[in-house]
């Protein structure tokens, strides 16, 4: 029976992935019962991605490693709508690392997943970025401008946001 074998495979995948994420929250995509898209619990989902707010304070490099251990990366923000979704889950008195850095200090900003950096889809606070020695980007809240990006020193511990594609089982 096709449905039975599909269910067995799905349960096998869920069991296998438990070693990385003890619980997954899955939804059926569209009308086809064959396709389940999942995010780890308690990650949040938006479009085809899953997001996790890491409240541990770490450097940018350690934050990225923390994400990659979970099969994710520091967040790459592609649209205003995506940023609007993300900020719903952030605390105004905290700052969070993004997957955006300028390793050479030459203002060649690059996303961790090599998505091209597009000046037209950036949300820097006014006057930012403003320091060649500040080579990593955070998102934070400023009362005058709401949520936006700022460049900071990469070694200064911050909270962070991880993002990964939904898991399909």
């Amino acid at each position: 029976n096709f449905m039975y074998s599909k269910t067995v495979k799905r349960l096998s995948k869920l069991r296998e992935y438990q070693q990385y994420h003890p619980s997954l929250t899955c939804v059926m995509e569209g009308k086809d019962i064959e396709d389940w898209s999942c995010c780890p619990t308690p990650w949040t989902s938006f479009q085809s991605s899953c997001y996790f707010i890491s409240t541990g304070m770490q450097s940018w490099t350690k934050s990225q490693k923390n994400c990659s251990v979970m099969g994710a990366d520091l967040v790459v923000i592609n649209t205003r709508e995506e940023q609007d979704f993300i900020i719903q889950n952030l605390k105004r008195n905290s700052s969070y690392f993004l997957g955006l850095s300028d390793p050479g200090g030459r203002r060649h900003w690059q996303w961790v997943d090599q998505t091209p950096y597009n000046e037209n889809v950036t949300f820097w606070h006014s006057g930012e970025p403003n320091n060649l020695d500040e080579r990593c980007a955070i998102i934070n809240f400023r009362s005058s401008e709401e949520w936006g990006w700022n460049d900071i020193h990469c070694h200064v511990p911050q909270k962070s946001i991880c993002k990964m594609k939904k898991i399909y089982i």
Epitope: E16, Y17, Q19, Y20, T61, Q64, K65, S68, V69, M70, G71, D73, V112, D113, Q114, M164, K165, I167, Y168
Partner: nanobody, 127 residues
């Protein structure tokens, strides 16, 4: 996480071949995309090749295309790098790296995206 151990390096004449191996232990090897990187003396670590967790997708640095082949045997928990027509500029320490992936076809060319690294194996090519 996975533990990685490279082997197969050594000294070889230009034009020769080597097959590097990277044996993994720990978590389920077939859940990890793998990559090879190298670091020559006085230079930054650079990407060489990468392979998806299923082995269905690969990618290479321009300098590796045509001479390098990455492959994996999930049953043996090992990833390989076959290097042919070795050049003196291939002299470097070669590292393998692993990264958890939930996508059968995803591969990763950036070192920062890998969570686990081996200790490296030295490759020296003389003319």
């Amino acid at each position: 996480q996975v533990q990685l151990q490279e082997s197969g390096g050594g000294s070889v004449q230009a034009g020769g071949s080597l097959r590097l191996s990277c044996a993994a232990s720990g978590r389920t090897f077939s859940d990890y995309a793998m990559g090879w990187f190298r670091q020559a003396p006085g230079k930054e670590r650079e990407f060489v090749a990468t392979i998806s967790k299923s082995g269905s997708s690969t990618d290479y640095a321009d300098s590796a295309k045509g001479r390098f082949t990455i492959s994996r045997d999930n049953a043996k928990k090992t990833v390989y790098l076959q290097i042919n027509s070795l050049k003196t500029e291939d002299t470097a320490v070669y590292y393998c790296a692993a990264r958890l992936s939930f996508d059968n076809t995803a591969f990763y060319t950036s070192a920062i995206r890998y969570s686990d690294w081996g200790q490296g194996t030295q490759v020296t090519v003389s003319s």
